[in-house]
């Protein structure tokens, strides 16, 4: 089976690497524009230069291309706690990240929110906080893990998953209650 190619890929595959087919004349291969530039005019003929212009401020192209417009620079999302790691240049998009002691949680492929790394109070750090993953905590005896925080077993309701982890404490509480009812 031959993989389906889009029109642009079909057109590009006829020309050697770094060139593309002239949209009006498929016997001409034009040189692609360098990163940081965009296509202003196709080359007039074989062996003649493509007219490429530099991207304007606030836009970029990160690879060789024959785009009619540069791409708009991304903005870091303040409401998601993002900070700018590096500014947009003509050949590279803005790089956004999180502050120190924070990690990225991806809600979707291209949307992340910054959250504080868990400190593992009433527990120990099992795995340190990473760029894209929160600290993994192990809780001390008498505590159970809920939403990556160590919570006292006194907050464990019998119906919750914590009952297995807090079983000795729950039994003790039950035993104390029983002894008081004789």
């Amino acid at each position: 089976l031959v993989p389906h190619l889009g029109d642009r890929e079909k057109r590009d595959s006829v020309c050697p690497q770094g060139k593309y087919i002239h949209p009006q004349n498929n016997s001409i291969c034009c040189t692609k524009c360098h990163k940081g530039t965009y296509l202003y005019n196709d080359c007039p003929g074989p062996g003649q230069d493509t007219d490429c212009r530099e991207c304007e401020s606030g836009s970029f192209t990160a690879s060789e291309n024959h785009l009619r417009h540069c791409l708009s620079c991304s903005k870091c999302r303040k409401e998601m706690g993002q900070v700018e790691i590096s500014s947009c240049t003509v050949d590279r998009d803005t790089v956004c990240g999180c502050r120190k002691n924070q990690y990225r949680h991806y809600w979707s492929e291209n949307l992340f929110q910054c959250f504080n790394c868990s400190l593992c109070l009433n527990g120990t750090v099992h795995l340190s906080c990473q760029e894209k993953q929160n600290t993994v905590c192990t809780c001390h005896a008498g505590f159970f893990l809920r939403e990556n925080e160590c919570v006292s077993c006194s907050n464990c309701k019998k119906s919750l998953e914590c009952t297995k982890l807090c079983l000795p404490q729950i039994e003790n509480v039950k035993g104390t209650e029983d002894s008081g009812t004789t």
């Epitope: 303040k78 409401e79 809600w107 929110q113 959250f115 504080n116 939403e147 990556n148």
Partner: nanobody, 119 residues
């Protein structure tokens, strides 16, 4: 007590429009960025759109970009989602929520409103 009440869902034909509303109470609405998420039958939660406190910065998932518009009226404590050019794949229960702060979970959200796109 935080309450979020979605409305405006219903049955609509492909290409049609709907406007969802979310009435908020029990917190200072104007201080909170707000989110629309949806859950299609048998699928997980999908982030649809969010809006900052003042309604200036917005975000849209690629699947709805150019078709949906999020807005808010802080004087009415209400969040909106204008949905145009609806497609069958937009069929889902739509929920509004406060943007999470402490961790990646929704502490408060409504009961949802069902949007069905079908001919």
């Amino acid at each position: 007590e935080v309450q979020l009440l979605e409305s405006g869902g219903g049955l609509v034909q492909p290409g049609g429009s709907l406007r969802l509303s979310c009435a908020a109470s029990g917190f200072t609405f104007a201080h909170e960025p707000m989110v629309w998420v949806r859950q299609a039958p048998g699928k997980g939660l999908e982030w649809v759109s969010h809006i900052d406190r003042v309604g200036q910065d917005t975000y849209y998932a690629d699947s709805v970009k150019g078709r949906f518009t999020i807005s808010r009226d802080n004087s009415k404590n209400t969040l909106y989602l204008q949905m145009n050019s609806l497609r069958a794949e937009d069929t889902a229960v739509y929920y509004c929520a406060k943007l999470p702060k402490r961790g990646p979970r929704f502490d408060y959200w409504g009961q949802g409103t069902l949007v069905t796109v079908s001919s």
